[in-house]
Amino acid sequence: ECVTRLFKDIHFEGGDIATVFTPSAKHCQVVCTHHPRCLLFTFTGESASEDPTQWFTCVLKDSVTETLPRVNRTGAISGYSFKQCSHQISACNKDIYVDLDMKGINYNSSLAKSAQECQERCTDDIHCHFFTYATRQFPSLEHRNICLLKHTQTGTPTGIMKLDKVVTGFSLKSCALSNLACIRDVFPNTVFADSNIDSVMAPDAFVCRRICTHHPGCLFFTFFSQEWPKESQRNLCLLKTSESGLPSTRIKKSKALSGFSLQSCRHSIPVFCHSSFYHDTDFLGEELDIVAVKGHEACQKLCTNAVRCQFFTYAPAQASCNEGKGKCYLKLSSNGSPTKILRGTGGISGYTLRLCKMDNECTTKIKPRIVGGTASVRGEWPWQVTLHTTSPTQRHLCGGSIIGNQWILTAAHCFYGVESPKILRVYIGILNQSEIKEDTSFFGVQEIIIHDQYKMAESGYDIALLKLETTVNYTDSQRPICLPSKGDRNVIYTDCWVTGWGYRKLRDKIQNTLQKAKIPLVTNDECQKRYRGHKITHKMICAGYREGGKDACKGDSGGPLSCKHNEVWHLVGITSWGEGCAQRERPGVYTNVLEYVDWILEKTQA
């Protein structure tokens, strides 16, 4: 059962598995949620103890019964992990804590104009986990406006002290705000020879990378595959770091793979969710339960529903015994990874999907693309919305994209002449316009946020956000698309599609069925040559065939230019403007979403 409330002046007795320091009970709850075993916690505030070294302690707890005895204790705050909850969980913490100093290894000191600038510096520094900033009221003259960047082995402070006239906070890497580059390549036959900070067992290099991305100290990794000659090191995932943030030495070794943490683009990749099945493989660990079930999918479901289960091994039924039911071994370990991985055992293993909700919903795999044809099928573009106006009569106005459970991203030019959000209706999960009847449910718009530098589509800043009056429940036919990562600035997208109900030629009408077209991106230099009378800025992105024939058109405005990269769809562009539709040597011009990620996050996370 999901319990989100905090219990004031209550201490949970026993079950301690770890003690960390957190600046608030709310943050303690997030740390507990991300810990592989924590189900409950007790946080000690300032008033709970005479001993300042005990302030801000967050005791992580586990219990076989999922509950612990409650004891009254002044100043203590207790609660439950969000593991039992179905809602999205984010590690992002934008809070700034006044008059607190989070302790760690202070490795960089520089002047900053504000706490915000200090936080940005931490976010853009590969090693930084949190920071402390001395305000201009700080007693020591030389320390005023000093920004201290800090890190620890665990990513959490080693202590928290009261200190007047300072503020402290965390890196915003997990909020998608880092400008650090993301190196997504996995290098085969490569060993990184830097120091190991930890090692775990993993079934493949991609799980190893996800573990590295989730581990606060890991900057890169080396994975020894099942074919690695040294048996004791097979399936070993070595988590690594270095002072420079890059591997100092790369050694060519076959059957090893190496790669980098994706910490600065983790919002657009699954980090916690290991959804694959590993055939002919046993995961060893502490056994929680053994249940007879039919098939490995049922076993995974069972593991996902058991809050303490971290991974499982399914032993298929022998012949026709036990009604075809095999044995489902539910397991756990201290770090969430198998203690050993055995191959050739006939078992099928995998991980709980309970952690998938810690990843951004936008990373969820969707139905495979239907190749050929121009009409879409249901669930193919689950982020695409149709925006209707009811004035003077109801009609399709523009497209848009779901980017959050209360947010639609679209084009600013759609709102020319729109006096009030009251006349707007957002329809989600729609394939055919004909589905929309009087009684079809829609989302009202609470607020239209147009970029304050927008004047007209052709001059850029053609971007707007719609805040919905109610939140969207995600399903297979309605879910968000990932924003591009600032760390992916150099990615070349090759699988891009434009979708919408717009005209199919210049003088036409709105289409009934959602249309799709695969369109190649065009460089800005090339695009500028095609539009000599306009300024194609870096805040625009162009797409189209040289010979024309496929393009966005009237009615597609505000809709997505969606590109698939590493199995995840990204909202690369917003349909904005162009000369005619699908004309030869006249590519479509789209708002370059990457350039507006900060603006989007600022508005949606305000």
Partner: antibody, heavy 124, light 107 residues
Framework: EVQLVQSGAEVKKPGASVKVSCKAS????????MHWVRQAPGQGLEWMGI????????SYAQKFQGRVTMTRDTSTSTVYMELSSLRSEDTAVYYC?????????????????WGQGTTVTVSS | EIVMTQSPATLSVSPGERATLSCRAS??????LAWYQQKPGQAPRLLIY???TRATGIPARFSGSGSGTEFTLTISSLQSEDFAVYYC?????????FGGGTKVEIK
């Protein structure tokens, strides 16, 4: 042993420039600020400015603004103080002095380590 | 800028006696004050920081007190090596400023 070793005495003509060096050893150079203080013959101490060796940021006393430049070379753990447009009243002993430890926040500190001083004589 | 005024300019004391040196700031410097000792031909040496905290290796006979605008350095029992010039310095605002110094001489 923590020490600051300064360059040797200089004799300069009015209008010229002088560059005094101060080499630090025995501690992490980039973790502490560095001050420059001068003392004219028979006079008191006068603060000239400060440099943060980590980022290289500086702050100068108004009196020396436009004439003084403080720099650092992290590879050799050395700070430099250059004073231009010298006049006879710049004749003094110039000291470098270690200031606050910048990797820790604490309320109070002083200049705890001083160089031996560099005598600069300005005379035509 | 903050002006630091030391008094007396010269203090004549016999060895073994107590010496009290004063330093006044033109505006409050809180406790951001340091004291230095300087002997002829030598660089200054830090004695006290934060108005009252002794620097490493400084004998207990040296003590500092005061806050705001009025500060005192006390040498409880003067030793022969204590005869020198003493400077106060404020660390509360730029530019840093020193007092004019108090010369402690043998009576």
């Amino acid at each position: 042993e923590v020490q600051l070793v300064q360059s040797g005495a200089e004799v300069k003509k009015p209008g010229a420039s002088v560059k005094v060096s101060c080499k630090a050893s025995g501690y992490t150079f980039t973790s502490y600020s560095m001050h420059w203080v001068r003392q004219a013959p028979g006079q008191g101490l006068e603060w000239m400015g400060i440099i943060n060796p980590s980022g290289g940021s500086t702050s100068y006393a108004q009196k020396f603004q436009g004439r003084v430049t403080m720099t650092r070379d992290t590879s050799t753990s050395t700070v430099y103080m250059e004073l231009s447009s010298l006049r006879s009243e710049d004749t003094a002993v110039y000291y470098c002095a270690r200031g606050a430890y910048l990797l820790e926040l604490y309320y109070y500190y002083g200049m705890d380590v001083w160089g031996q001083g560099t005598t600069v004589t300005v005379s035509s | 800028e903050i002006v630091m005024t030391q008094s007396p300019a010269t203090l004549s004391v016999s060895p073994g006696e107590r010496a009290t040196l004063s330093c006044r700031a033109s505006q409050s410097v809180s406790s951001n004050l340091a004291w230095y000792q300087q002997k002829p031909g030598q660089a200054p040496r830090l004695l006290i920081y934060g108005a009252s905290t002794r620097a490493t290796g400084i004998p207990a006979r040296f003590s500092g007190s005061g806050s705001g605008t009025e500060f005192t350095l006390t040498i409880s029992s003067l030793q022969s090596e204590d005869f020198a010039v003493y400077y106060c310095q404020q660390f509360n605002d730029w530019p840093l400023t020193f007092g004019g110094g108090t010369k402690v001489e043998i009576k």
